[in-house]
Interface confidence: low
């Protein structure tokens, strides 16, 4: 008798990995024999299409090389002719091993950057992406993150950072490394040791000592008064990113001596400067007797600070007075740009009046000292964390203790305002405006309007400018 | 301002259940593993359970094992810790802490006030 | 399971140095175990003070500071302020494959004498 078809085994959905064969089996009761088609996503699969094997009269249908591409919803139709047509379907999920489809590759990148290491992966299901770092799986943490994609973000790069990355890609069906991959770290150039300042006799040799560290390791070059060392000879060795520097002169005249330490970026360099003086004893005199003279200030760097038409002292125990001290300053300057705005203006009064202190005119041309005062009121008031961070730099070493005119001075071997008003100067800059305390007065007379508190003597400290960091 | 608020603690009785919430705002909460960590009166913290930035792994202290889940709904910022079975020594103020990275096992760098979950007949 | 070990108590004076530990019951502390630390102040919730061994959380003053000294942990505190009195707590990652822990320790109360 002729019977409608019936399908006694429903497709089910079928999991299958790539390159291997998938089978779906529509098994049908019917008479006469039904014709049974096959359909992919609703489109008919054709018979003659080679990728595929239907046997069984219809009923198994043969994906023979599984590619992604093969995901889909797979539905068999049975029609005899006798009654309707009937369906069956049933899905076939695609599993992938894991695969890296872009891996990471070698990064060189500036201490200090952001940088990211590629890691794209396929799988079914999807994989879960780790990374190695050396033999260790790498732990997140605030600077660390594996993001979405499985690219590895490090931000604010450190040193500790540089060395060997893989990123791993894991599913149920496996797991998939990339290849090795180096995350080279560069670091700008940075002076460890700078050179001390010297006051020797005429015609006795120094050396200067400049250290100095960055990835690659910098080269050093040396300066006198602006000009390459003429002579003087030149030591140098490099141990474990650290190169030594000496440079040994015979001194017939004062200098100003800069060790300028450079290293290369791609294109771009990175330098860093510290400078020490040379001076001969004769001509450091006590405080009385030094040698210089007054003349108007005519720099750039202390223009807003010091007194319109300041008379200040130049002390010709540098060969170009103006020039060596102005240097001095500029050298400075740039360490103050990251203090508090607090801070800031105070420092940059105290530096620049330190530099260049006011000047009385007189038969022999006397430099003015600061107020011990006004030296307290920037140390323990306007600059209090600034100044005891540069202290514990200090006590570490990563600055001088001494560098001549580049230290502010010891505030407790300042003369007092109270002693002799007229035998220090006062900064106009720290002067309390009654209204606003926080502001600072403009520069019109050397005379402040309110005494500054008396605050208590603290012991003897010097306040360091490390040297400066340029790109160019 | 970053915030997590911790609520669902209470008293329970030996044996019953209690789910806690963790309300998380001012963070990108679906880019941070997230903890639970409990301290139970006058004694130290003890980390509990931990799940990353996804909810992709689950990860508990040995002792509450098959009892606790740990889970997350990052599109209502929120985290979850289903604890059945409850034991009297599982009372305690209860933590929700933001880890510090997308990993379940970063520092705990911010945390929530606290619910207070006593077990007592 | 490992036992994380630190002192029950220390004292310090306002100003002074002290060292707090953090040891493991068995074998030694790494920067593998990523040594964080905590401080708790009576009825707040803790505050992460360092983590990995010796970075220091954002807001936290320089006065703390982290290190792995021998086998152990070590959290300083260098000019000790009234306001360090409190319970620290350190806490080791214990990773081995899926079986991942988080130890802390039993906590060290601090009083700033």
């Known amino acids: 008798l002729p019977k409608a078809p019936v399908i006694t085994t429903p497709l089910e959905t079928v999991d299958a990995l790539v390159e291997e064969v998938a089978t779906f089996m529509c098994a049908v009761e019917s008479y006469p024999q039904p014709e049974i088609s096959w359909t992919r996503n609703k489109i008919l699969i054709k018979l003659f299409d080679t990728r595929y094997s239907i046997r069984e009269n219809g009923q198994l249908l043969t994906i023979l090389s599984v590619e992604d591409s093969d995901d889909g919803i797979y539905c068999c139709t049975a029609n005899n002719g006798v009654g309707g047509a009937v369906e069956s379907c049933g899905a076939l999920q695609v599993k992938m091993k894991p695969k890296i489809t872009r891996p990471p590759i070698n990064v060189k990148i500036i201490e200090g950057l952001k940088a990211v290491l590629p890691c794209t992966t396929m799988g079914n299901p999807k994989p879960s992406v780790s990374w190695i770092k050396g033999d260790s799986p790498l732990r997140e943490n605030s600077r660390t993150a594996v993001l979405e994609s499985g690219s590895l973000r490090i931000h604010n790069v450190q040193k500790e950072d540089a060395g060997q990355y893989r990123c791993v890609a894991k599913n149920s069906l496996g797991t998939a490394y990339s290849k090795v991959v180096k995350l080279e770290v560069e670091v700008f150039a940075r002076i460890l040791r700078a050179p001390e300042s010297h006051n020797v006799t005429f015609g006795s040799f120094v050396t200067l000592h400049c250290t100095a560290t960055g990835i690659p390791v910098p080269t050093i070059t040396w300066i006198e008064n602006g000009n390459a060392v003429s002579s003087g000879s030149i030591q140098e060795s490099v141990k474990d990113r650290v190169i030594d520097s000496r440079l040994q002169l015979f001194i017939t005249k004062p200098g100003l001596y800069t060790c300028i330490a450079t290293n290369k970026h791609g294109e771009k360099f990175s330098t860093a400067k510290a400078a020490a003086t040379v001076s001969i004893a004769e001509w450091s005199k006590p405080q009385k007797d030094n040698k210089g003279y007054c003349a108007q200030y005519r720099g750039e760097v202390c223009n807003a600070v010091l007194a319109k038409d300041a008379l200040v002292f130049l002390n010709t125990s540098y060969a170009d007075p103006e020039e060596a001290q102005e240097l001095l300053v500029h050298t400075a300057w740039n360490e103050l740009k990251v203090v508090s705005p607090l801070c800031r203006p105070a420092a940059e009064a105290l530096l620049c009046n330190h530099v260049f202190q006011e000047c009385s005119p007189g038969v022999v041309p006397t430099p003015i000292p600061i107020c011990r005062e006004y030296c307290l009121a920037v140390k323990e008031l306007f600059c209090a964390k600034e100044w005891l961070a540069m202290e514990e730099k200090t006590h570490r070493g990563l600055y001088r203790s001494e560098m001549h005119l580049l230290s502010v001075p010891e505030c407790s071997k300042l003369p007092s305002m109270h002693w002799d008003p007229t035998a220090c100067a006062r900064l106009p800059h720290l002067d309390y405006n009654k209204e606003n305390p926080k502001t600072f007065p403009p520069m019109t007379s050397s005379k402040p309007s309110v005494d500054i508190p008396n605050l208590p003597s603290s012991s003897s400290s010097s306040f360091s400018v490390s040297p400066t960091y340029s790109m160019t | 301002e970053l915030q997590l608020v911790e609520s669902g603690g209470g008293l329970v009785q030996p044996g019953g259940s209690l789910r806690l919430s963790c309300a998380a705002s001012g963070f990108t909460f679906d880019d941070y593993g997230m903890s639970w960590v409990r301290q139970a009166p006058g004694k130290g913290l003890e980390w509990v359970s931990a799940?990353?930035?996804?909810?992709?792994?689950?990860y508990y202290k040995e002792s509450v094992k098959g009892r606790f889940t740990i889970s997350r709904d990052n599109a209502k910022k929120t985290l979850y810790l289903q604890m059945n079975s409850l034991k009297s020594e599982d009372t305690a103020v209860y933590y929700c802490?933001?880890?510090?990275?997308?990993?379940?096992?970063?520092?705990?760098?911010?945390w929530g006030q606290g619910t207070l979950v006593t077990v007592s007949s | 399971q490992a036992v994380v070990t630190q002192e029950p108590s220390l004292s310090v004076s306002p100003g002074g140095t002290v060292t707090l530990t953090c040891g493991l019951s068995?074998?030694?502390?790494?920067?593998?175990?990523?040594p964080d630390w905590y401080q708790q102040t009576p009825g707040q919730a803790p505050r992460a003070l360092i983590y990995?061994?010796?970075s220091r959380h954002s807001g936290v003053p320089s006065r703390f500071s982290g290190s792995i000294s021998g086998n152990k942990a070590a959290l300083t505190i260098t000019g000790a302020q009234p306001e360090d009195e409190a319970d620290y707590y350190c806490?080791?990652?214990?990773?081995?494959?899926?079986?991942?822990?988080?130890?802390f320790g039993g906590g060290t109360k601090l009083t700033v004498l």
């Open positions: 806490a080791l990652y214990m990773g081995r494959g899926s079986n991942k822990d988080y130890v």
């Open positions: 799940i990353p930035w996804n909810g992709g792994s689950t």
């Open positions: 068995s074998g030694s502390v790494t920067s593998s175990n990523y």
């Open positions: 802490a933001k880890r510090s990275g997308r990993i379940a096992f970063g520092a705990l760098d911010a």
């Open positions: 990995s061994t010796n």
